[in-house]
């Protein structure tokens, strides 16, 4: 099952994915695609890395804002719309026999909340779900691969979100 990430319409979505180049600087191809990872490559490719280049970007809204030369291949989707919702595949194409890593990440885009700011509660929310709801331009400072993320379901997130909204908090997820 996919780990779920939430972003508001108009904000930036951050989908984490990383690997450790071994040895350092020895980069492997990575593809990002819309749709669950198939047996090979990525379907509906949104971008891919080859050596030190980013190629096949299908939209100017797709970016690798981390240091992908060091293995941070997390995807940022700028100015998300409801149509961006869905499963994304991050495939780290490590050479060899059945070595490539595939990660399915589910992006849920929600309509923005019309509520007043409450920074303290916002901080509480992002510390409670630091890798699911993120406010920074680059998402969480600590990059992890999806397989190591905490198991938090969407119902829990929405429940907490609704509770905080009821108390006047701003839920701004980027």
């Amino acid at each position: 099952s996919e780990v779920e990430y939430i972003a508001e319409v108009g904000q930036n979505a951050y989908l984490p994915c990383s690997y450790t180049p071994a040895p350092p600087g020895n980069l492997v191809p990575v593809c990002w695609g819309k749709g669950a990872c198939p047996v090979f490559d990525c379907s509906n490719v949104v971008l891919r890395t080859e050596n030190r280049d980013v190629n096949d970007r299908t939209s100017g809204r797709y970016w690798l804002k981390g240091d992908f030369h060091k293995g941070d291949v997390s995807l940022t989707i700028e100015n998300v719309t409801l149509a961006d919702s869905g499963v994304y595949c991050c495939r780290i194409q490590i050479p060899g026999i059945m070595n490539d890593e595939k990660h399915n990440l589910k992006l849920v885009v929600i309509k923005p909340a019309k509520v007043t700011p409450a920074p303290t509660l916002q901080r509480d929310l992002t510390s409670a779900f630091p890798r699911m709801l993120t406010t920074g331009e680059h998402g969480p400072a600590e990059t992890q691969t999806p397989g190591s993320l905490p198991d938090v379901n969407l119902t829990q997130i929405f429940t907490l979100t609704n509770e905080l909204r009821d108390s006047g908090a701003t839920i701004r997820t980027a």
Epitope: P38, F40, D41, S43, N44, M98
Partner: antibody, heavy 123, light 108 residues
Amino acid sequence: QVQLVGSGGGLVKPGGSLRLSCAASGFTFSDYYMSWIRQAPGKGLEWVSFISGSGSIIYYADSVKGRFTISRDNAKNSLDLQMNSLRAEDTAVYYCARDGMVRGMNFYGMDVWGQGTTVTVSS
Amino acid sequence: EIVLTQSPGTLSLSPGERATLSCRASQSVSSSYLAWYQQKPGQAPRLLIYGASSRATGIPDRFSGSGSGTDFTLTISRLEPEDFAVYYCQQYGSSPITFGQGTRLEIK
């Protein structure tokens, strides 16, 4: 025209080795993943192995892992399958097939097939 | 591994009739990764449908595919004499790539 031609089949004793080849023409070979599929007499299709366009990514079916080796030479537009430690159950027609493109945008299907080459493993 | 089960095993119909072939997966397969093939005796398989519903190049429009999740269908709207063959479904959703056991379409 787009074509795949397989060769190298034959009769071999159990425990023996055989090398199958597939010559590609009519398309940019290095752009495509390639697969080997086999079909035992009177049976259905069984996927054996695939290799990425660059040759860096390889997958095998459990039934052949450790015994078969897939490789390609993009300069020669050729695909090979080295088969070692052959068993009676490896007896089949072996097909090479062109898979989805490396830069495919949603195409998963084997759209070009070789004519098949027969491998018989028997004492 | 994803097991694909095709039914019926054999389908006996006459030219001009409609054929409906089923492929059921043991676990969900994205529709993008489901293909159908036709194989005639002594020949290599021929790709008919990819992405569950897209016809491959040169395939007549009497062939159509549908379905999602675990249930997929190949329909031949009006059988021609050359359509009698064995049909296989195949999934690319997870390794290993797997095929169904085949449905034999024979002349009644």
